[in-house]
Structures are given as C-alpha cells and as structure tokens.
C-alpha cells in the first residue's frame, strides 16, 4: 500500500532509505532537455519474492530535440556528483547497505537522469535522518521514521532528532555502526 504523504521534515536534516520495500516506485524522470523514450517505463518498481528483490523496468531518457535511441550507461563522476535522492543532498548508497529480504537496493543511475529522484514509498518503509553539514545531532531517540497505516490513512512516525548549529555531522546508520534492521517492522494496518 502506497504511503500517501511524505516523511516528516526536520529542520537542518535530510533523510534517505537504506533499502526500499517491495512495492516502492521510482519515477523515471529525465534531466532538462531530455524526456522518457516513447513507450518507455513511467516508473521503476521494486518487486520480488521472499528470497530476492529487484527493480522491474528500466528508465531511459532521450534528447527532447532529436529522435536518436538511448543506451543504459552509468554517468561520468562529474554527472553523478550532482544527483541526489528525493529530498536528500546526501551521497547515493552506503557501501555496507544491508541486503534485507523483501527490499531493493538503490537503483543504479541511468543516462540523463534528473538530479532529483522521486520515490513513492509503501507502508512499512523506514527512512533515516542525518543533520546537514554544519549541524550536530541531538538524539532523544531513533533518528528514523516509518510509514504506518491506521484506519486506512498513512502517516510517518516522528523521528527523534534535533539538529543544532555546531560543526559536527552525524552519519546515516551503516556509516558508523550497524543498526537494527527494519524488516521486522509492521506493515499491516495498525490496530485502531
């Protein structure tokens, strides 16, 4: 079930997912001057079974001006540098991202991809927060948010994070120490 709202905004903080639950959709967006190829996929979709999950469909962009065909290639480092995940200025995927059952990893870039990725999360998805550069994290609890469903309405839990203006940055989980895996989180309707 799709989460019909967005993860909370925390002042001076950004969020990202370590892995994406099955059902997550990623818009096939192209950078300015490019468009999706005709009859190309609108979305990539995280699908799979209990043992393996992967992204269905491939996003492909072509020049808006010409009709030439496109190929799937990884952008050069300078192109990659500008990209960001939805509402995140952080790097793409931590190298030690856990392989969670029923989850997909960050999809690889596609040629002429837009700079911002637009994900459509599903119930049970967890995202992690970190303070932006120049701000320090004061934790009152987990710096994470989970999409839950109650009475048919979806909502994200409030991350317990305050970012103060001191020159020390916090890291995403996995970039400092292992975290509890989100796979045990409830994805069914919360009891009313």
């Amino acid at each position: 079930e799709l989460c019909d709202d967005d993860p909370p905004e925390i002042p001076h903080a950004t969020f990202k997912a370590m892995a994406y639950k099955e059902g997550t959709m990623l818009n096939c967006e192209c950078k300015r001057g490019f468009r999706r190829i005709k009859s190309g996929s609108l979305y990539m979709l995280c699908t799979g079974n209990s043992s393996h999950s992967s992204w269905d469909n491939q996003c492909q962009c072509t020049s808006s001006a010409t009709r030439n065909t496109t190929k799937q290639v990884t952008p050069q480092p300078e192109e990659q540098k500008e990209r960001k995940t939805t509402e995140m200025q952080s790097p793409m995927q931590p190298v030690d991202q856990a392989s969670l059952p029923g989850h997909c990893r960050e999809p690889p870039p596609w040629e002429n991809e837009a700079t911002e990725r637009i994900y459509h999360f599903v119930v049970g998805q967890m995202v992690y927060y970190q303070c932006v550069q120049g701000y320090r994290a004061l934790h009152r609890g987990p710096a994470e948010s989970v999409c839950k469903m109650t009475h048919g309405k979806t909502r994200w839990t409030q991350p317990q994070l305050i970012c103060t203006g001191e020159m020390e940055t916090s890291q995403f989980p996995g970039e400092e120490k292992p975290q509890a895996s989100p796979e045990g989180r409830p994805e069914s309707e919360t009891s009313c």
Epitope: E1, D5, G23, M25, M149, G152, K153
Partner: antibody, heavy 116, light 106 residues
Framework: QVQLVQSGAEVKKPGSSVKVSCKAS????????MHWVRQAPGQGLEWIGY????????EYNQKFKDKATITADESTNTAYMELSSLRSEDTAVYYC?????????WGQGTLVTVSS | DIQMTQSPSTLSASVGDRVTITCSAS?????MHWYQQKPGKAPKLLIY???NLASGVPARFSGSGSGTEFTLTISSLQPDDFATYYC?????????FGQGTKVEVK
C-alpha cells in the same frame, strides 16, 4: 468538520479550458495530498492525479498528463484542476478527494459539459 | 496499470437478500478498498484495507480477500443499500477503480 466545496457546473466549447476549484476546510490543508477523480456520464471512477499542497509537487495518471494541470493555493486552502483543449469526451463530473490514504472526504463534484 | 474487474456489473436483489460482489485485480495488491455511490452524489468510503468498516457503516457490510481476489458482502440487503459499489486499489500508480457494480431492486 472536514469539508471540500467545489466550484459550480461549467459549460464549455470544444478547444477551450476550464478551471475547477476545491476549497478545503476543517483540517490542515498542507498535511494531506489532494486527489482528483473523474466520472464520465454513466461510467466508473478514474483517478486523475494529486498534488502535495505544501510543495506543489504533482503526480498524474499518464492518461491525463496532457489534459489536467493540478495546482494549489495554500493561502486560501484551495486546490485547482485546469482541463485544457476540451473535447466532448471530457464531459464528466470531476471530484476532489482528500488523500493521506483512502479517500475519506470528497467534494460534491463539478459537472463539466463540453458542447458546441 | 492494475486492472480491476468487478462482477457482476449489475445485480438485481430484494430487501433481506445476501449480496456478494467480487473484485479481481490483474496483479496482486496489498489491500482492497470499497466505495458506495448513489445517483448524483459523491462516492462514500465503505470499507478500507479489505475488511475494516468506515465510520458509521452498518455491520451488515463486510469485506474479505487477499492477493488478487476480494469480496464485498451485504448480509441482509436494506432499502438504503441500493447503490453502485466500486472497488479501489492504491498499491501502485496509477490508482485504479473497478468499473462498478449496480445493486438494483429486483
């Protein structure tokens, strides 16, 4: 109490445009996405798309991508949907519905009739 | 897109009858939601997340199912229940509805 009040019925010529409004009250407008749904005469329901009022981000059903433009005005708690290049097939009742999951509140509907 | 196929399209029944409407999704979905619509009115949420009754909905309505097959049941049809019923999925975009089942007086 939550209310979604839509603008009145419209009769339009083919090729013209129309802008339907949906004024929300009784809840925090920016906390919920606003969806739009179409119902042609004697037909079923079709999802058009939604807007996140806070950021203005929209997501459309590809079928309506070139037909509908959804906007929102935070200052008046109003969502809008503009339909362009109208054709007789666009004759329908258009509903706004509060998102955040299932559509628990709906506008009363706006009948748009396209006729020469 | 996920296609939703409701059956039957029209159902003729009498007050007191047990009525069952089925909705089949072209792909597996998490939950099914059901709406009731009366002529000239906006749809009204009836059942959410497959089996939960919306606020104020009588207990004669029930929902069940999983995967691709879902059912809406009215245990004892009442005069107020003659209407059109729509199933709805919001597991993936675009969101889609069934074509509707009209419950009419026999």
């Amino acid at each position: 109490q939550v209310q979604l009040v839509q603008s009145g019925a419209e009769v339009k010529k083919p090729g013209s445009s129309v802008k339907v409004s949906c004024k929300a009250s009784g809840y925090t407008f920016t906390s919920y996405r606003m969806h739009w749904v179409r119902q042609a005469p004697g037909q079923g329901l079709e999802w058009i798309g939604y807007i996140r009022p806070k950021k203005g981000y929209t997501e459309y059903n590809q079928k309506f991508k070139d037909k509908a433009t959804i906007t929102a005005d935070e200052s008046t708690n109003t969502a809008y949907m503009e339909l362009s290049s109208l054709r007789s097939e666009d004759t329908a009742v258009y509903y706004c519905a509060r998102g955040g999951g299932v559509f628990d509140y709906w506008g009363q509907g706006t009948l748009v009739t396209v006729s020469s | 897109d996920i296609q939703m196929t409701q059956s039957p399209s029209t159902l003729s029944a009498s007050v007191g009858d047990r009525v069952t409407i089925t909705c089949s999704a072209s792909s597996s979905i998490s939950y099914m939601h059901w709406y009731q619509q009366k002529p000239g009115k906006a749809p009204k949420l009836l059942i959410y997340t497959t089996s939960n009754l919306a606020s104020g909905v009588p207990a004669r309505f029930s929902g069940s199912g999983s995967g691709t097959e879902f059912t809406l049941t009215i245990s004892s049809l009442q005069p107020d229940d003659f209407a059109t019923y729509y199933c709805h999925q919001r597991s993936t975009y675009p969101l889609t509805f069934g074509q509707g089942t009209k419950v009419e007086v026999k």
